[in-house]
Interface confidence: medium
């Protein structure tokens, strides 16, 4: 069965100065590859976090990602302020060369 | 050949707002992006926001944000990009530009208007 | 926000020569979402190269992009009158930024 990638909570209600988790989970550990978060979808999306590489000081993930089988991919963004607001998108990349590929969206 | 026409040139006041028109011709206009820059007399390219008419919301740029509203209207084919509160510094020539299919990534900008000259002057 | 920084500022070439403009970015692109662009004085700009190295429709083959990750490389081979003008890198990895241009003159 392909990859799904499952984001549970239509929205999160998070006040000034807490902490948002921002949950999802991948149905399968195929295709290989990282998870990125993103604000907003399509032209002019903001890159929020890349499993990776990259310096996210605001963001912290769930669970351990460098292990090998594991399916979750919720991350956690602190102190939010008003400007925060939007829809966010787990992004499921695979693997490429030279670069990785978009493969599905939650 | 997917063509973008832009409104005419515009001279506004301090603390108006400006809205300019971006009508596509010659190729399917919902499903793909229609991106705003603008580019200050002497300066670069600078972005301002995105919309996919078939999704209709827009992304802006988080210097324009609040600012700017980028809206489409499918059944002619046009987007709008209107700007508040003007100051002397937008001053400048604004320009549509088509990106990639809604369905895919490939957001780089592959047709571009001719551009609107808006001159912000008391 | 992903800064793109270009260089040199400006370049002084003779038609016949080999220009290479360098773009560098703040933190790692994919090279997917990598495009250059050339402007001329009172035109809009021209769409050259997008994902890094492929050709836009109808852009000649002297034009050329290649690099990844926060090192991308527009050359122009060999280079023709019409070719001197403003070029401008962009990511669409994370929103959308420009670099600042580089603007390439007759020697």
């Known amino acids: 069965e392909e990859l799904q990638v499952i984001q549970p909570d239509k929205s999160v209600l998070v006040a000034a100065g807490e902490t948002a988790t921002l949950r999802c989970t991948a149905t399968s550990l195929i295709p290989v590859g990282p998870i990125q978060w993103f604000r907003g979808a399509g032209p002019g999306r903001e890159l929020i976090y890349n499993q990776k590489e990259g310096h996210f000081p605001r963001v912290t993930t769930v669970s351990d990602l460098t292990k090998r089988n594991n399916m979750d991919f919720s991350i956690r963004i602190g102190n939010i302020t008003p400007a925060d607001a939007g829809t966010y998108y787990c992004v499921k990349f695979r693997k490429g060369s030279p670069d990785d590929v978009e493969f599905k969206s939650g | 050949q997917v063509q973008l026409v832009q409104s005419g040139a515009e001279v506004k006041k301090p603390g108006s707002s400006v809205k300019v028109s971006c009508k596509a011709s010659?190729?399917?206009?919902?499903?793909?992006?229609i991106s705003w820059v603008r580019q200050a007399p002497g300066q670069g390219l600078e972005w301002m926001g995105s919309i996919i008419p078939i999704f209709g919301t827009a992304n802006y740029a988080q210097k324009f944000q609040g600012r700017v509203t980028i809206t489409a209207d499918e059944s002619t084919s046009t987007a709008y990009m209107e700007l508040s509160s003007l100051r002397s510094e937008d001053t400048a020539v604004y320009y549509c530009a088509r990106g990639g299919y809604a369905a895919g990534t490939d957001y780089y900008m592959g047709v571009w208007g001719k551009g609107t000259t808006v001159t912000v002057s008391s | 926000e992903i800064v793109l920084t270009q260089s040199p500022g400006t370049l002084s070439l003779s038609p016949g020569e080999r220009a290479t403009l360098s773009c560098r970015a703040s933190q790692s692109v994919s090279s997917s979402y990598l495009a250059w662009y050339q402007q001329k004085p009172g035109q809009a700009p021209r769409l050259l190269i997008y994902?890094?190295?492929s050709r836009a429709t109808g852009i000649p083959d002297r034009f050329s992009g290649s690099g990844s990750g926060t090192d991308f490389t527009l050359t122009i081979s060999r280079l023709e009158p019409e070719d001197f003008a403003v070029y401008y890198c962009q990511q669409y990895y994370s929103s959308y930024t420009f670099g600042g241009g580089t603007k390439v003159e007759i020697k």
């Open positions: 010659g190729g399917t206009f919902s499903s793909y992006a």
């Open positions: 994902g890094a190295s």
